[in-house]
Interface confidence: low
């Protein structure tokens, strides 16, 4: 397993609709054709997988149908969007990148993006 550097922003604030976007950039040591991107959430020293996608270079990322993540790729950058976030989902979101094919296998893990989610205030009653 060879190490690879992965960069991601330190802090991101989710929108009022519970959507957070950030860029995950990796320093590819070779010409990978198949890349796997995994988003991990670390909270209270527990690491859980949020979503994952494999993509062929130049193609779209394909997350599972029920995934809360979407994304696009451009060269060695992946633009990730996580939806449906609530205040309880605030935490450190870590980008894990694996260069799957061709060998050798490379693995890189970012330092994480702290995503802050603030639940919107309920709207007051209105006659409109």
């Amino acid at each position: 397993c060879k190490a690879m550097h992965v960069a991601q922003p330190a802090v991101v604030l989710a929108s009022s609709r519970g959507i957070a976007s950030f860029v995950c950039e990796y320093a590819s040591p070779g010409k990978a054709t198949e890349v796997r991107v995994t988003v991990l959430r670390q909270a209270d020293s527990q690491v859980t997988e949020v979503c994952a996608a494999t993509y062929m270079m130049g193609n779209e990322l394909t997350f599972l149908d029920d995934s809360i993540c979407t994304g696009t790729s451009s060269g060695n950058q992946v633009n990730l969007t996580i939806q449906g976030l609530r205040a309880m989902d605030t935490g450190l979101y870590i980008c894990k990148v694996e260069l799957m094919y061709p060998p050798p296998y490379y693995l890189g893990i970012g330092n994480g993006t702290q995503i802050y989610v603030i639940d919107p205030e309920p709207c007051p009653d209105s006659d409109f």
Epitope: C1, E34, R36, V47, E49, E98, M100, Y101, L107
Partner: antibody, heavy 122, light 107 residues
Framework: EVQLVESGGGLVQPGGSLRLSCAAS????????MSWVRQAPGKGLEWVAT????????SYPDSVKGRFTISRDNSKNTLYLQMNSLRAEDTAVYYC???????????????WGQGTLVTVSA | DIQMTQSPSSLSASVGDRVTITCRAG??????LAWYQQKQGKSPKLLVY???TLAEGVPSRFSGSGSGTQFTLTISSLQPEDFATYYC?????????FGGGTKLEIK
């Protein structure tokens, strides 16, 4: 219920070949990365080979690289391990194992078969 | 390859005892560690993954902890069915390697 049943083990001479099979049931086989793990008599566990869901990616440790080939037939729900140029040190129980879920590649082995014994001896 | 070292290699304990098994990784593997139990003549069974998450159906007397390079598997109160060999395994990249095992025997 997840079931993995290995077959094809037996006695083979050094330099010989053997093909192991693993019949899978109780889950959607094509959705999961699969592996082979072996255990020499009285020894610990050693990962042997891994194949991705569609079969496009395979991985091996140096100890078997170039001699062993992992493959799968998703239409038959079957995993294979073709072992060539066998050596005495390949003697072991070979387990078929399923990764925990299909959405990641490098993970733990959540389900194991009962194993099949391969003995390499003159 | 990442070297995984387990200690002790064997351990004698009694029913009801609290037992701790240690696994050390040769480099930082974050929380990418799994524990397995193997009874004599049987295939291994997953106990813990991601260092501390119990696999489905595993009794709560088992617990995993640690991150980085130091990990532990604890059995809070040994039951007769817990006497077996325990293995750790990293799942931080390939090749995945196992510890040498810890054989837990009845005192």
């Amino acid at each position: 219920e997840v079931q993995l049943v290995e077959s094809g083990g037996g006695l083979v001479q050094p330099g010989g070949s053997l093909r192991l099979s693993c019949a899978a049931s109780g889950f959607t086989f094509s959705s999961y990365t699969m592996s082979w793990v072996r255990q020499a008599p009285g020894k610990g566990l050693e990962w042997v080979a891994t194949i991705s869901r569609g079969g496009g990616y395979t991985s091996y440790p140096d100890s078997v690289k170039g001699r062993f080939t992992i493959s799968r037939d998703n239409s038959k729900n079957t995993l294979y391990l073709q072992m060539n140029s066998l050596r005495a040190e390949d003697t072991a129980v070979y387990y078929c194992a399923r990764e925990d879920y299909g959405s990641s590649y490098v993970h733990w082995f959540a389900y194991w078969g009962q194993g099949t014994l391969v003995t390499v001896s003159a | 390859d990442i070297q995984m070292t387990q200690s002790p290699s064997s351990l004698s304990a009694s029913v009801g005892d609290r037992v701790t098994i240690t696994c050390r990784a040769g480099e930082n593997i974050y929380s990418y560690l799994a524990w397995y139990q193997q009874k004599q003549g049987k295939s291994p069974k997953l106990l813990v993954y991601n260092a501390r998450t119990l696999a489905e159906g595993v009794p709560s007397r088992f617990s995993g902890s640690g991150s980085g390079t130091q990990f532990t598997l604890t059995i809070s109160s040994l039951q007769p069915e817990d006497f077996a060999t325990y293995y750790c395994q990293h799942h931080y990249g390939s090749p995945r390697t196992f510890g040498g095992g810890t054989k837990l025997e009845i005192k």
